[in-house]
């Protein structure tokens, strides 16, 4: 764009150099050239000469009018055709921008990743504004009434050191640009309720060589949180549908989870946890792929057929992936829930 230009005259924009997308816009060019009575005044947008909707107002001034201007950015300049000059003479130039006032930020969420030392807040910014937009995060203690503000672009990390005076806060986000300002809804935050346990990792898996082979998945976390609730999802690499198994975990030792799976198949496993009774989940762990061993017996085994299943408090549900290319972004699509697991002694993950 045009940042520094020596003008021999003036250029101005109505309603202003930054305006709402879709507005009608008038751009004026006024020459102040020495030794030139211009025959014509020309307008250029992004280097291309404009042909239409140009009005000569008087000897020194012309205007170009745009109906419903909808380009996010353009650089305009105007020139004069001076008698006796081979080339047009530059008068002035301006960068112009169009955009939208911000939407109110939505889906404000704040979490503390265990050991991070930060409260991380994220939100949806809404539709693109096309112009520079700032986000101001307000954090107000409900106990001391002290308010802090943080400037952000799309998320903010606030050191928990600056949140020492209180456990309960009100958090909201202001979106600000030159066309307007909107506030998010206020979020009530209790620091003890938003901790996400330290990442859970699947370290290895093995399939036993029994008559009915079972796969044992070993997983761990460095969390210090005592009561943790976890989900492990698994599927064959060729399948779209995940099965999900739920666990109450105690990470003072490595967790072992048993599965009765199709033989000679490649499975992918992922795990995620939350503090029991809280609402914020870890992201799913990195996919862990395990190949089950070839079937040794001749029985055509059905994973969920009797007599291998008995009722339990654990849950296995069916979840369908939206896209096989996005293993981290899954959605519950079906409501098929199977409460049960294959019987084989004590499977309650007692390490």
């Amino acid at each position: 764009g045009i940042t520094s230009i020596n003008c021999s005259g003036d250029m101005w924009v109505e309603p202003g150099e930054i305006f709402q997308m879709g507005m009608n816009v008038s751009i004026y060019c006024q020459e102040a050239l020495k030794h030139c009575r211009p025959r014509n005044l020309y307008f250029y947008k992004n280097g291309f000469k404009e042909e239409f909707d140009i009005t000569r107002i008087n000897r020194t001034t012309a205007r170009i009018w745009y109906k419903g201007f909808s380009e996010p950015h353009a650089y305009m300049h105007c020139t004069a055709e001076c008698p006796g000059h081979f080339q047009e003479t530059l008068i002035c130039g301006k960068d112009i921008s169009s955009g939208h006032p911000p939407d109110a930020p939505s889906n404000l969420t704040c979490v503390i990743y265990e050991y991070s030392g930060n409260m991380t807040c994220t939100w949806n910014t809404g539709k693109p504004t096309y112009i520079d937009t700032k986000y101001i995060v307000h954090v107000k203690s409900l106990e001391t009434e002290e308010e802090q503000q943080y400037l952000a672009s799309s998320y903010v990390k606030i050191s928990t050191d600056s949140l020492q005076g209180s456990r309960k806060y009100l958090v909201w986000v202001q979106a600000v640009n030159s066309l307007g300002m909107e506030n998010s809804q206020q979020l009530h935050v209790h620091l003890d309720d938003i901790v996400i346990p330290s990442a859970s990792i699947i370290s290895r898996a093995e399939t036993t060589n029994d008559t009915v082979p079972k796969t044992i998945v070993y997983w761990k976390s460095k969390t210090m949180i005592e009561k943790v609730f976890c989900e492990m999802r698994y599927k064959t690499t060729t399948n779209q549908t995940w099965s999900v198994k739920e666990f109450d975990a105690n990470f003072t030792y490595v967790q072992q989870s048993e599965f009765y799976l199709e033989p000679d198949s490649k499975y992918v496993f992922q795990v995620r946890c939350q503090e029991t009774g809280k609402r914020n989940w870890q992201p799913w762990s990195s996919p862990f792929v395990h190949q089950t061993s070839q079937e040794t017996g001749k029985r055509n085994w059905q994973p969920w057929s009797s007599p291998f299943v008995h009722q339990t408090s654990q849950t296995v549900s069916q979840v369908t992936a939206k896209s096989s290319h996005e293993p981290q972004k899954m959605e519950m699509l079906s409501a098929t829930i199977f409460r049960g697991h294959p019987a084989s002694g004590n499977h309650q993950d007692i390490g």
Epitope: E17, I18, D95, S97, I131, D132, T133, K134, I136, Q148, Q149, Y150, L151, A152, S153, V156, K157, S162, V176, N177, S178
Partner: nanobody, 116 residues
Framework: QVQLQESGGGSVQAGGSLRLSCAAS????????MGWYRQAPGKERELVSM???????FYADSVKGRFTFSQEYAKNTVYLQMNSLKPEDTAMYYC??????????WGQGTQVTVSS
């Protein structure tokens, strides 16, 4: 750490004008997003005007067309020219320096009182 010092407040009749100044020291204020804020008694601090980027300034609806934000790089100073003042503009006015991800730093404030 940046230090901010406001000045220029005072008492004025409705319809009058004031020019507030905010001088920054101890920091390259060019890396700040500078703003003017105000707090009336018993109310929350509110954003009055903010320099969003070059050539782009936010003004609260209540001050649009009456207040003008400007800056003087050489003096590390920003200004708020307040014209056509109204009694509802009475408040403590603060300037703030915000940098991405950091806590906003405030000046001590300067009192503006508009009487009818």
């Amino acid at each position: 750490q940046v230090q901010l010092q406001e000045s220029g407040g005072g008492s004025v009749q409705a319809g009058g004008s004031l020019r507030l100044s905010c001088a920054a020291s101890g920091y390259t204020y060019s890396s700040c997003t500078m703003g003017w804020y105000r707090q009336a008694p018993g109310k929350e601090r509110e954003l009055v005007s903010m320099l969003i980027s070059d050539g782009s300034t936010f003004y609260a609806d209540s001050v649009k067309g009456r207040f003008t934000f400007s800056q003087e790089y050489a003096k590390n100073t920003v200004y708020l020219q307040m014209n056509s003042l109204k009694p509802e503009d009475t408040a403590m006015y603060y300037c703030g320096c915000a940098t991405l991800g950091s806590r906003t730093v405030w000046g001590q404030g300067t009192q503006v009182t508009v009487s009818s």
